[in-house]
Interface confidence: low
């Protein structure tokens, strides 16, 4: 059955209740110079509008503090209102390493990120940090790497490893959950000139992730004891016509091309899914495509296999798919899939269908295919036009969390966290935020607060209290480090 009745019950005490933000652009300077500048100024407000130093007056100064960053104050205010236990945000690779290598490290950017993490910890909010979050407008790569063919160049994977090592070294004492790359399986939207470009870029992204994971595993895990994975875009697929075999096959093929493409090599075999490889090869044989998945060497298979500590999925909706034979040598046509927009379904302004039961099906599919592992939903949300009473978002959150709870209670899926997407919306982008672009809170925040404080949807008389030892204590030593390690 697709929809089943709501359940009453709670998520475990160590469940991560999170909110996700995309790339945080670091502020270059703390915005409170008065604390480091001992001079007093008067503002000539009516004349030349300049600040004029008052001679002979000296003020007490104090060391710079994290909260001198205006941006961080805003972040913290929003996070405090969210009542989450975890905050997922992404670093800006291009800001941290403008040259793409370790020859010019932007220490100020790292200090800013360290401040975000340490100030969050003071509020009891742990960070899940994403190292690389490509956006469709811009790949988010340092310029020199972008100009050297980006992800089509294998050396970008080595550059990523060096960058990851720097971040582990600088932030790893405070950060215990890492995402190397956000949605590498959607970079097909950018590297789409040909299927071979798409598969070549994907291959280098896989290698980049694996190199970073193995570096962490060997050099940093023993002392930092964190966990590393990558986040896959993981929408569910259903046959548009449940009575057509070809539609069922198309739905499974969508999952193979979208999720298994990255999950199979990392979680399971070290190689691409046989179903995907065979499908592309059969199209190749019939002259319908000149695409080919890269052939992995023994060494590459061993490099990739097993390089995840947990499964991280970004899930937003369910797609309704049908088979349609497409010619052309591009990733989109290699799949032979056509999407159907079901206008009878509740949908968002950007046409994202609200299909709560899809997330439960996804979680079961992942467990069936890749085994019983810890799973985090690292982004899940909907766009809602309302600037105050965002009822669609409240409905979405309630229903999707219900299905996640069913997966936990009934299907026994090891679901460890849910991160709602996203903290604040950006101007002129679809409205996914709990806060508007000028930081006004929406009513879905109270709804999410209530679910978090109840740990789900408890029976009337059940306690939502957790003992301190049961709660998420992944960073008990972090607060001590925040005080002791200089920023």
């Amino acid at each position: 059955k697709e929809s089943t009745p709501d359940v009453q019950g709670q998520f475990p005490c160590d469940f991560s209740w999170g909110v996700t933000e995309s790339v945080l652009k670091p502020e270059s300077v703390a915005s409170s110079p008065q604390f480091s500048d001992p001079h007093l100024y008067v503002w000539n407000a009516t004349g030349n509008r300049l600040l004029h130093r008052v001679e002979g007056v000296r003020l007490k100064t104090r060391p710079a503090q994290c909260t001198d960053f205006v941006n961080i104050k805003k972040q913290l205010e929003m996070l405090a209102r969210m009542k989450v236990t975890h905050y997922r945000f992404a670093l800006d690779w291009a800001s941290v390493l403008p040259t793409g290598n370790l020859s010019a490290v932007n220490r100020q950017a790292l200090r800013y990120y360290r401040c975000v993490v340490s100030e969050g910890l003071k509020l009891g909010i742990s960070a899940m940090v994403t190292l690389y979050y490509p956006t469709h407008a811009h790949l988010g790569l340092p310029e020199p790497l972008l100009h050297a063919d980006g992800w089509l160049n294998p050396s970008t994977a080595e550059a990523f490893q060096a960058y990851a090592g720097l971040c582990f070294q600088e932030l790893g004492d405070l950060v215990k959950l890492w995402i190397t790359i956000n949605e590498p399986n959607r970079l097909s939207d950018i590297y789409n000139r040909s299927g071979n470009d798409t598969y070549g870029a994907a291959h280098n992204l896989l290698v980049a992730h694996a190199l970073a994971w193995r570096l962490y595993d060997r050099q940093f895990r023993p002392s930092q004891r964190g966990a590393v994975s990558l986040s896959l875009h993981a929408d569910w697929a259903e046959p548009a016509n449940p009575y057509a075999d070809s539609h069922w096959r198309a739905a499974e093929r969508f999952l193979q091309f979208e999720i298994a493409w990255f999950a199979e090599p990392l979680f399971k075999t070290g190689d691409y899914p046989a179903a995907m490889r065979e499908y592309i090869a059969s199209k190749h044989r019939r002259g319908l495509s000149s695409s080919a998945l890269p052939r992995l060497t023994e060494a590459e298979r061993r490099l990739l296999k097993g390089t995840v500590d947990f499964c991280a999925l970004n899930h937003f909706t369910t797609r309704f798919v049908m088979h349609e034979q497409l010619a052309g040598s591009r990733y989109d046509s290699d799949r032979d899939i056509q999407f159907l927009q079901d206008i009878t379904r509740l949908s968002s302004p950007t046409r994202l269908a609200v299909i709560p039961w899809g997330v439960r099906k996804l979680l079961r599919w992942v467990r069936r295919n890749y085994g019983d592992m810890d799973i985090y939903i690292t982004a899940s949300g909907i766009d809602d036009q309302a600037l105050e009473d965002d009822r669609l978002r409240k409905y979405y959150l309630g229903k999707y969390l219900q299905e996640v709870l069913k997966a936990y209670l009934i299907d026994k899926v090891r679901i460890k966290g849910y991160y709602a997407f996203k903290l604040a919306e950006e101007k002129s982008k679809p409205r996914f935020g709990f806060f508007t672009s000028d930081f006004k809170a929406k009513s879905s925040i109270q709804f999410y607060n209530k679910v978090i404080s109840s740990r789900g949807f408890p029976f009337e008389n059940s306690s939502s209290r957790c003992s301190q030892t049961q709660e998420n204590t992944e960073c008990t030593v972090c607060l001590f480090l925040v005080q002791k390690k200089p920023l």
């Epitope: 080595e158 291959h203 190199l211 570096l215 595993d217 050099q219 023994e298 590459e300």
Partner: antibody
């Protein structure tokens, strides 16, 4: 300390078999290949094969198929190599070595070696 | 199988001078931007010790006087300046495909 601990020297008769062990510690045993390497006295190094304890998959050098059998026990974090139908050609020091974190298949951590002597 | 040929078989070097060891593969051991060639040092009665991985990367804890270079079929290990403790046999090893193979070794003596 990640260095694997190998079992002690073995003196065995021709035609017999021997099983040598390699105990891992200081890391997650199921995440890395354990390789076995042979070195005859005064000679070079020969790769025998690897076992991946995560799923107990194995790969052998064709030259050692039928001669060496690689196994692993996850509960004790120990890898084993059994050599059968021993002849004087099999007298050698046998090393176990853990592969590195790069997937480059270089061997970072080596056991101290087990000397196997085949003699009547 | 890929055959690795090391030269010279032995080498006597004065303290403080440069030692250069070559390793030639019967076919390319490079792919996808990586060269799957590694170098080890072995002293009598001890297991080999990894010095260089993926052709040119210095293993942690290994002195910077060791360096590796090369791609495709030709690879070189350099030691400069040579020190007393560098007297040992050096092996190259590839991991491009199965079976992994080692070179025959180069014995370095200090004059």
């Amino acid at each position: 300390q990640v260095q694997p601990q190998e079992s002690g020297p073995e003196l065995v008769k021709p035609g017999a078999l021997v099983k040598i062990s390699c105990k891992a510690s200081g890391y997650t045993f199921t995440r890395y290949d354990i390789n076995w390497v042979k070195q005859r006295p005064g000679q070079g190094l020969e790769w025998i094969g690897w076992i991946y304890p995560g799923d107990i998959s194995t790969k052998y050098n064709e030259k050692f198929k039928g001669k060496a059998t690689l196994t692993a026990d996850k509960s004790s974090s120990t890898a084993y190599m059994q050599l059968n139908s021993l002849t004087s050609e099999n007298s050698a020091v046998y090393f176990c070595a853990r592969s590195d974190y790069y997937g480059s298949r270089s061997f970072v951590y080596w056991g101290q070696g087990t000397l196997v002597t085949v003699s009547a | 199988d890929i055959v690795l040929t090391q030269s010279p078989a032995s080498l006597a070097v004065s303290l403080g001078q440069r030692a250069t060891i070559s390793c030639r593969a019967s076919k390319s051991v490079s792919t996808s931007g990586y060269s799957y060639m590694h170098w080890y040092q072995q002293k009598p009665g001890q297991p080999p010790k990894l010095l260089i991985y993926l052709a040119s990367n210095l293993e942690s804890g290994v002195p910077a006087r060791f360096s590796g270079s090369g791609s495709g079929t030709d690879f070189t290990l350099n030691i400069h300046p040579v020190e007393e403790e560098d007297a040992a046999t050096y092996y190259c090893q590839h991991s491009r495909e199965l079976p992994y193979t080692f070179g025959g070794g180069t014995k370095v003596e200090i004059k």
